[in-house]
């Protein structure tokens, strides 16, 4: 049924879906705080621009009785139930901020004629790529894939003189939502990553992973996994690792590596950590004071979603354009706006761009050090440490296949 949008005559509403099933186990109260903090900023910005309008958020909660797994497994139905709720109430805002689970976002996008923009803090999977009215404010799997392929191919750095074409991927099914979709993308046989690699095998059992670490007949020296250092330790423990093994630990939403007093444990010496460049400190903001580093990114994405809406609203109002049009719905891409923590860039498909950082453990200082950065917007690598103090032989990353000489 046709749902009227509360989105004109100087009053603009944001529909925020507060789903029990979420990409990160974040209390909904914290997300509300983030949204409200965003609203305050948007109101201030609009006022400064001489636009005397009202901007509010309506929080739409699901009943939580049926869909209570807390993770994303039952999110598909919860998302559709919330849309039904909106439809029944005949009330929809100018924009929908909400589903963070890939399942729910995909289904909601499929099952509705979206003439309004959808902003997601999550929806990491490849199935949410290239959606015309969907904007994603946390790095999706496609961006990770492009980095990995770029890094695999690189062979002209002082510390990486071999291009790689092989990899193991560890994926045991217990991953967090972001990791699940990142690894899912690497596993998919039709994905860019799989297409560019000559050999790729998924390890699903702990024992498989543990055996590879010292297996002389292994087909690759490189293992990709996703999670934090503790996750790796549970799996690897203090087991011996062959000297030319490289573990790539994808841990994008974790600022802990950059904290001053952090020392890398010994088991991280064969590991390169891929994370996101930390923004300016969010610790002093009211919404993030009680959040863990990972959850800061999630709450920040909600806040930035509000700021993005404010940015677009301001542009359309200043140009005298209608908000309830397909043009508005399709406009949330290929732009840079002022986020809570600095400029935020969205690519042509509405996905956030960021600076990924590859860290290594210095054998001298036992600290995490930046090896290189990667700008997802231009798909370019920037070497930072030209002579890293690696654990690997000659302080160079080994070849991905043992015994294969220079190419």
């Amino acid at each position: 049924s046709q749902v009227s949008q509360n989105c004109h005559n100087g009053s603009y509403e944001i529909s925020v879906l507060m789903m029990g099933n979420s990409a990160f186990a974040e209390p909904l109260k914290n997300l509300e705080d983030a949204v409200n903090e965003g609203l305050e900023i948007v109101r201030g910005r609009l006022q400064n621009a001489g636009l005397n309008v009202t901007v509010n958020a309506t929080f739409m909660y699901s009943d939580g009785l049926i869909h209570n797994s807390g993770d994303c497994r039952s999110s598909t139905c919860e998302g559709l139930d919330l849309l039904r709720k909106i439809s029944n109430a005949q009330r929809m805002g100018c924009v929908l901020i909400g589903p963070s689970c890939t399942y729910s976002t995909f289904q909601m996008y499929l099952d509705t004629e979206l003439s309004y923009p959808m902003i997601s803090a999550g929806s990491f999977g490849l199935s949410c790529d290239y959606k015309e009215t969907l904007t994603r404010l946390m790095s999706p799997a496609r961006k990770l894939m492009y980095f990995l392929v770029n890094f695999w191919k690189t062979n002209d750095l002082p510390f990486k003189t071999y291009s790689w074409s092989t990899s193991y991927v560890y994926k045991n099914g217990t991953e967090t939502e972001d990791c699940f979709w990142y690894l899912n993308a690497l596993e998919a046989s039709v994905s860019y990553f799989s297409h560019e690699l000559g050999f790729k095998v998924v390890l699903r059992q702990d024992k498989e992973f543990q055996d590879i670490l010292m297996d002389h007949n292994r087909k690759s020296n490189v293992i990709i996994m996703c999670g934090g250092p503790e996750f790796l330790y549970k799996l690897k423990g203090d087991r011996a690792v062959a000297e030319d093994i490289v573990i790539i630990l994808v841990d994008l939403f974790n600022d802990q590596y950059f904290e001053d007093n952090v020392t890398a444990p010994d088991y991280m010496k064969n590991v390169l950590v891929l994370t996101l460049s930390p923004g300016n400190s969010l610790l002093n903001s009211s919404f993030s004071r009680n959040l863990s580093p990972t959850k800061r990114d999630f709450a920040l994405a909600y806040l930035n979603g509000i700021l993005l809406f404010g940015h677009m609203l301001k542009i359309f109002l200043e140009n005298g354009e209608n908000i309830t049009t397909p043009k508005f719905a399709h406009a949330f891409r290929n732009l840079t706006f002022e986020g809570y923590d600095g400029p935020v860039t969205l690519d042509d498909w509405g996905d956030v761009d960021s600076t990924m950082v590859l860290l290594y453990t210095s054998v001298d200082t036992k600290k995490y050090k930046v090896l290189l950065t990667y700008d997802t917007h231009v798909n370019k690598t920037y070497p930072v440490d030209m002579s890293p103090t690696f654990t690997w032989k000659n302080s160079k990353l080994p070849n991905d296949i043992t015994g294969r000489g220079p190419q």
């Epitope: 191919k153 690189t154 062979n155 002209d156 002082p158 920037y382 440490d385 030209m386």
Partner: antibody
Framework: EVQLVQSGAEVKRPGSSVKVSCKAS????????MHWVRQAPGQGLEWMGI????????SYAQKFQGRVTMTRDTSTSTVYMELSSLRSEDTAVYYC?????????????WGQGTTVTVSS | DIVMTQSPLSLPVTLGQPASISCRSS???????????LNWFQQRPGQSPRRLIY???NRDSGVPDRFSGSGSGTDFTLKISRVEAEDVGIYYC?????????FGGGTKVEIK
């Protein structure tokens, strides 16, 4: 306009050290990597090493490992190249050269060169 | 390291006539991204080098269109369609396909 201005000519005794400076202007100092390239009289160009002004990390050509040190001073946008244990074969013109990395190294701008003569 | 070999060592040319310099690499310069990282530099007498061509055939700004680069894999050529007096000097090829970058030995272009 990008400019790389190098220090003046030097005459050195064998066994001593020389430190050549290269002052950058006209761009953000940390946005280009700095290469050092030398050219002995009547010879070709020889790549010596590179420094990342952003963090000060370096990588040197095998031939110069242990003898060359590249440093930078961000407050003055200056890069330095010090070569120790000089011998007569080190007599050459030394160039600093700014470049970028984009899946392949480039050398975009060159200093005017510093002549170092090693003679007893 | 990749070895770059240039020929000829010396190239005497007549003003207004074409000139061609060859550069050969010890292995393919095609990078994994599909690009070929081969640069050409010009060094006039008493001056610093300057880049003329990057990625085989792309001319730098300010470089006259009489200069052109071509080639693929391991064989590359710098052509000057009509040599002028200001073209006298030494020309170097340089690869940046893998670490470390290396230069060719140079070709001296002089007027007959």
């Amino acid at each position: 306009e990008v400019q790389l201005v190098q220090s003046g000519a030097e005459v050195k005794r064998p066994g001593s050290s020389v430190k050549v400076s290269c002052k950058a202007s006209g761009y953000t100092f940390t946005s280009y990597y700095m290469h050092w390239v030398r050219q002995a009289p009547g010879q070709g160009l020889e790549w010596m090493g590179i420094i990342n002004p952003s963090g000060g990390s370096t990588s040197y050509a095998q031939k110069f490992q242990g003898r060359v040190t590249m440093t930078r001073d961000t407050s003055t946008s200056t890069v330095y190249m010090e070569l120790s244990s000089l011998r007569s074969e080190d007599t050459a013109v030394y160039y600093c050269a700014a470049g970028t990395y984009s899946s392949g190294w480039t050398i975009d701008y060159w200093g005017q060169g510093t002549t170092v003569t090693v003679s007893s | 390291d990749i070895v770059m070999t240039q020929s000829p060592l010396s190239l005497p040319v007549t003003l207004g006539q074409p000139a061609s310099i060859s550069c050969r690499s010890s292995q393919s310069l095609v990078y994994t991204d599909g690009n070929t990282y081969l640069n050409w530099f010009q060094q006039r007498p008493g001056q610093s080098p300057r880049r003329l061509i990057y990625k085989v055939s792309n001319r730098d700004s300010g470089v006259p269109d009489r200069f052109s680069g071509s080639g693929s894999g391991t064989d590359f050529t710098l052509k000057i369609s009509r040599v002028e007096a200001e073209d006298v000097g030494i020309y170097y090829c340089m690869h940046s396909k893998q670490w470390p970058p290396t230069f060719g030995g140079g070709t001296k272009v002089e007027i007959k």
